[in-house]
């Protein structure tokens, strides 16, 4: 048999709006009063097992006690009414769970979407958190007929159970209800056909055109509710290695279509495409993007000739010379296809010509000491580039006109070169550079610059702390001009070793010190100056600074018959390095002097 409780708390299921006041009462039964020898003044209120302060409690009469809470904020509180039976033993009378929260806000931003092939899904913003169990019901009706309610599981969306009917307007709203209140959203009225999100286009294929290397043709399949809807498209593309997409203007794809030709593309370039669709009126939602598809534009003839230069080897006797013609492979953006070979035509001044087809990027030919004209064209399967033309003058002709004010400097981890053009119109410039070393030959790299350029950076892979010999040669229609050279560093460092000092001549009060220049491989930068430190075993150290152009220096005012320790350091812009210490002793007497 269930024991009857000694009393009750009212209300039995309290729900309180946060921040408000709340009063509960506990009513004891008459039988309980007599059995335990108590009255309402013996009641102890507790929240979560902690006694409520007496100032919140009021004894209304011998059976009833009330408790008042102000500014309720806890989401859930266990409220119990207890009695001190026989004045001392605490015994529970009744307990309730007090909940706090907010009435529902009016739902806003109600929107609906019909994902093709699925039922309609509506979403809304429920407003602030209620902290209470709140039911959201999506209601929908025609002017003449109600549809089944949609009970939301998440409180922010609901998918209706019925298939949408197109071309008939529907009214939709949301009702929100909890223990503290009930509220409805504004209703929205629409034709479900205007809320369709089509499935993505599929079977996207890309084909190129032999006639036009700047276009790719796309074709795809659209669904559009099985042809019920006319769809317009959105096409985006990018080169294979790019991360940003290029947009085909939407006005070009407004009419319903399942194919499109993308223009103004680069030849022999792989492009990636994606496409999405929407109802042609623009109402509804864009589909997700299709799977990506790629295609490569057709080849076009190379857009420019390769950079072209030559080097002359010493002549064989005086009858002819060996000339090495060199050129650079075109970058993909200019090759416009796979370069099959290069055509070199050499014409002697007497109109004798010889044609060579070369697959590499150099050709060595033997030429007499006459003037020659060399032309070079790159060929892919579509055709040949324009020709680069070089005049190779007779070795007896002295080159005139060079660039002036040649400078080189590092900036942003690049080695820049600039110059002032010569006073005669230039066809192009050739820059050559190599690492100066006493241990290895100077292996040259080179690049070509247009006639309009007078400042550029070296485009090879340069090393830090290495001395580069840079040569700039202007090239005219009649042949190369004079070459100007300088030395430069991409980045200097302190020298790898300091100078080794020695004595050239030692006198009673002076000594001539000498040293060799540090080998270029160890300099690591431009040697700006030297410091000479010298001291006796007991005296303080003296330091003198010497210009980097010197290889000897005279120390004066020395003491006779004294041991000196000398050390030299060499400095670049990035620091110095000491050489080994050297000792010498001054004689007691000058030459010819006697004790």
């Amino acid at each position: 048999q269930l024991l009857e409780p000694c009393g009750y708390i009212y209300p039995e299921f309290p729900v309180v709006q946060r921040g408000s006041n709340f009063t509960a009462i506990c009513v004891l039964k008459e039988a309980c009063l007599q059995h335990y020898y108590v009255n309402a003044s013996y009641i102890v209120w507790k929240t979560n097992h902690a006694a409520v302060p007496r100032e919140q409690v009021t004894v209304i009469n011998r059976t009833t006690s009330s408790v008042t809470f102000t500014d309720v904020v806890l989401p859930s509180v266990q409220l119990t009414c207890n009695i001190l039976s026989f004045g001392q033993i605490e015994q529970n009378v009744y307990g309730v769970t007090m909940l706090s929260g907010f009435p529902p806000d009016k739902p806003t931003n109600l929107t609906c979407i019909v994902n093709e092939g699925k039922n309609m899904l509506c979403q809304w913003d429920p407003g602030r958190e209620t902290y209470l169990e709140t039911n959201y019901t999506l209601k929908s009706e025609w002017a003449t007929e109600k549809f089944p309610d949609c009970q939301s599981k998440h409180g922010t969306s609901c998918m209706v159970s019925y298939m949408p009917t197109y071309y008939v307007n529907i009214e939709v709203w949301v009702e929100a209800e909890n223990a503290l209140g009930k509220v409805s959203s504004e209703s929205i009225n629409f034709d479900p056909v205007d809320k369709v999100k089509p499935t993505p286009p599929y079977n996207l294929s890309v084909t190129n055109s032999e006639e036009l290397s700047s276009i790719l043709k796309l074709s795809w399949v659209s669904s559009g509710l099985g042809g019920l809807l006319d769809l317009k498209s959105d096409i985006q593309y990018r080169t294979k290695d790019a991360s940003t997409w290029i947009q085909v203007p939407l006005e070009d794809t407004m009419s319903p279509r399942t194919s499109f030709t993308v223009q103004d593309l680069k030849p022999f370039t792989e492009y990636v495409f994606r496409i999405r669709s929407i109802k042609d009126s623009g109402k509804g939602y864009w589909s997700d993007w299709s799977e990506e598809a790629s295609g490569t534009t057709y080849e076009d003839r190379p857009s420019r000739p390769p950079s072209f230069w030559y080097k002359t080897n010493p002549s064989h006797g005086q009858e002819y010379r060996s000339v090495r013609l060199i050129w650079k492979a075109l970058p993909l953006s200019e090759a416009n296809g796979k370069i099959l070979d290069y055509e070199v035509i050499l014409t002697q001044s007497k109109s004798v010509s010889q044609t060579y087809t070369v697959t590499g990027t150099e050709l060595t030919v033997n030429l007499t000491n006459d003037r020659y004209v060399a032309s070079l064209a790159a060929r892919n399967k579509v055709g040949k580039s324009a020709a680069a033309v070089l005049t190779i003058p007779s070795p007896h002709v002295t080159a005139a006109y060079s660039v002036v004010n040649l400078k080189a400097f590092p900036k942003d981890n690049l080695l820049w070169v600039e110059w002032t053009p010569p006073p005669k119109p230039v066809s192009k410039y050739i820059l050559e550079w190599c690492v100066l070393s006493e241990n290895a030959p100077c292996v040259e790299d080179w690049q070509q610059e247009d006639a309009t350029v007078n400042r550029t950076h070296l485009r090879g892979r340069l090393l830090e702390s290495k001395c580069y010999q840079i040569t700039v040669t202007p090239v005219f229609a009649t042949g190369p001009g004079g070459s100007e050279s300088l030395k430069a560093y991409l980045k200097q460092a302190a020298p790898a070793r300091g100078p080794t000092v020695r004595t050239k001549k030692v006198g009673k009060n002076e000594a001539v010190l000498a040293w060799d220049q540090i080998p270029v491989d160890d300099q690591n930068g431009f040697i700006r100056n030297y410091s000479i430190s010298y001291r006796t075993s007991v005296g303080k150290e003296m330091v003198v600074h010497v210009d980097s152009s010197h290889t000897e220096y005279t120390l004066s005012s020395l003491s006779s018959d004294t041991l000196y320790m000398v050390r030299m350091a060499a400095y670049t812009d990035e620091g110095g390095k000491d050489g080994p210490e050297f000792t010498f002793t001054t004689p007691k007497f000058a030459q010819g002097e006697i004790e």
Epitope: Q354, V365, N366
Partner: nanobody, 125 residues
Framework: QVQLQESGGGSVQAGGSLRLSCVIS????????MGWFRQVVGKEREGVAA????????IYADSVKGRFTISQDSSKDTVYLEMNGLKLEDTGMYYC??????????????????WGQGTQVTVSS
């Protein structure tokens, strides 16, 4: 390595004919001219005829113009010298040579880098 091998020499009566052949092998470099030269004992080697391997143009020494004809069969890497109306002064050692020099002076012997061993031609009365 490059080898030039002549053949077709021999003895012939004045007014007679001979056809010399020269096969070139091992030539990775593209030659620009193939030439025939001759040398009589005690005299300098002189140019007789040359042919451009690219365009097929020919050049002859004045002393053989109208009598000698140089031709090539590029598929066989072979050059021929057809000699008609031979004279006593045509006697000598005939050498085939290859040049890599782009030039119009195609019978200047200093411009030829590769030479055969020679084949003897003797014209008697």
């Amino acid at each position: 390595q490059v080898q030039l091998q002549e053949s077709g020499g021999g003895s012939v009566q004045a007014g007679g004919s001979l056809r010399l052949s020269c096969v070139i092998s091992g030539f990775t470099y593209r030659q620009t001219f193939m030439g025939w030269f001759r040398q009589v004992v005690g005299k300098e080697r002189e140019g007789v005829a040359a042919i451009s391997t690219g365009g097929g143009s020919t050049i002859y020494a004045d002393s053989v113009k109208g009598r000698f004809t140089i031709s090539q069969d590029s598929s066989k890497d072979t050059v021929y010298l057809e000699m008609n109306g031979l004279k006593l002064e045509d006697t000598g050692m005939y050498y085939c040579a290859a040049s890599t020099v782009i030039t119009s002076e195609s019978i200047n012997r200093n411009l030829y880098q590769y030479w055969g061993q020679g084949t003897q031609v003797t014209v008697s009365s």
